[in-house]
């Protein structure tokens, strides 16, 4: 008795975070025996879409010509072979930016910080929001969520970093969002360049130490620690 069919691979090009109005292509790759591919979207009637395979039959293309709120969400794909349907792929979370006006990102006390000192990145929105995200450019896992307790709406979120090391240096942006859809984000804030000065190269903090490390040259995810003063937000990992 053969085991279950291997699950397909699901990905988006040019990426899974897409600005409103831009095009995106979702790809599902299965096996050469695939007869059809099916794409399911969470909380939508199934199948959300289905496509015949492209030659040589091991993948299918699902096109979204213009990104809108309706397309944001969590997707899975399947393929059908002569012996039946595959396992579902791992989920793909398609996020749309541009749903709300852009927040402002600033550094307190300054974007110029000495190694070993503390800095807080402050993301402020014009209207109350309940989720704020901080991302660092060129990080593989860039999203840090701060979500308010009990759905309380906030105008800002603080992302403290202490002690700062050289890996914290780089370009940051933040987004704001409403909790009713984690897949709809604001326009990105203008970029903030965090410059870490210091004569000696700082050692990378080990994961066991109680410090906040930003995603750096080796694509570490942001790992927040400590309290979030004045924001009423709690730290929340997705």
């Amino acid at each position: 008795q053969a085991g279950p069919l291997p699950k397909p691979t699901l990905w988006a090009e040019p990426g899974s975070v897409i600005s409103w109005g831009n095009s995106v292509t979702i790809w599902c790759q299965g096996t050469l025996e695939a007869r059809e591919y099916r794409l399911d979207k969470e909380e939508s009637p199934a199948p959300w879409d289905r496509q015949n395979p492209l030659e040589p039959k091991n993948k299918a293309r699902f096109s979204i010509p213009s990104m809108t709120e309706d397309y944001a969400g969590r997707y899975r794909c399947y393929y059908r072979s002569p012996v039946g349907w595959s396992q579902p792929s791992d989920p793909l979370e398609l996020v749309m930016t541009g749903a709300y006006s852009k927040p402002t990102l600033s550094a307190l006390p300054s974007p110029l910080v000495t190694s070993g000192k503390s800095v807080t990145l402050l993301c402020q929105s014009r209207s109350p929001m309940d989720t704020f995200l901080l991302i660092k450019e060129r990080a593989a896992h860039p999203l840090l969520h701060l979500r308010s307790e009990h759905g309380a709406q906030q105008h800002q979120a603080e992302f403290p970093m202490s002690p700062v090391t050289s890996v914290h240096g780089g370009t940051y942006r933040c987004f704001s969002s409403h909790g009713f859809s984690h897949y709809l984000l604001s326009h990105p804030s203008d970029p903030l360049e965090l410059i870490v000065s210091g004569s000696l190269e700082d050692p990378r903090p080990s994961p066991t130490r109680s410090v906040s490390t930003a995603a750096g040259p080796e694509d570490q995810p942001l790992m927040p620690t400590g309290s979030v003063p004045h924001s009423g937000l709690r730290r929340h990992w997705e």
Epitope: R35, R38, W48, D49, N52, P82, V83
Partner: antibody, heavy 120, light 105 residues
């Protein structure tokens, strides 16, 4: 009871367009794909295409891509097929058919068909 | 595209008797075949899918079998309401219909 009620017979001139309708009842319209099938007199059936009423996604038989356009009106639970640049080859009975939810079989319920006659 | 050759194109039926219709695919369709009954002025009615699975409410005198490229559909204990046209549909790769079999008295 699931029912697909199709619009009445049409007589149209060559070169014109026509829009056929299929009103669904007895089930949640947006939960099932809707297909369209063509049957010419004395010939077999041909699959034209399908539409997902919940999001408007469509797939077409290559042969009908420039001939048929599928749309839906969710508020009235109605599917439509517009046929353009009609010729005598388009004279046929057209069926709408509900796609099975699991896709284990393509069509589980059909409309009664609409007869289209293209003649000058 | 997969071609479906359905035979015979017409068939005389005797009430209480049995008839068999066959569909031959141009390649292996892996049991992805359905059978429909079609009466004039009505929409086709799904009888069997995936070679032999009867739809709910369909009497057991309808049956299907087969594998690979060759499939058959039978009606036993024929009744007057069985007079209709029957056709097969393969849905392994895309969708292709058989030409139909007209069952006559």
């Amino acid at each position: 009871e699931v029912q697909l009620q199709q619009s009445g017979a049409e007589l149209v001139k060559p070169g014109a367009s026509v829009k056929l309708s299929c009103k669904a009842s007895g089930y949640t319209f947006t939960n099932y794909w809707m297909h369209w099938v063509k049957q010419r007199p004395g010939q077999g059936l041909e699959w034209i295409g399908e539409i997902n009423p919940s999001n408007g996604r469509t797939n077409y038989n290559e042969k009908f891509k420039s001939k048929a356009t599928l749309t839906v009106d969710k508020s009235s639970s109605t599917a439509y097929m517009q046929l353009s640049s009609l010729t005598s080859e388009d004279s046929a009975v057209y069926y709408c058919a509900r796609g099975s939810l699991t896709t284990v079989v393509p069509f589980d319920y059909w409309g009664q068909g609409t007869t289209l006659t293209v003649s000058s | 595209d997969i071609q479906m050759t359905q035979t015979p194109s017409s068939l005389s039926a005797s009430l209480g008797g049995k008839v068999t219709i066959t569909c031959k695919a141009s390649q292996d369709i892996n049991n992805y075949i359905a059978w429909y009954q079609h009466k004039p002025g009505k929409g086709p009615r799904l009888l069997i899918h995936y070679t032999s699975t009867l739809q709910p409410g369909i009497p057991s005198r309808f049956s299907g079998s087969g594998s690979g490229r060759d499939y058959s559909f039978s009606i036993s204990n024929l009744e007057p309401e069985d007079i209709a046209t029957y056709f097969c549909l393969q849905y392994d790769i895309l969708l292709t219909f058989g030409g139909g079999t007209k069952l006559e008295k």
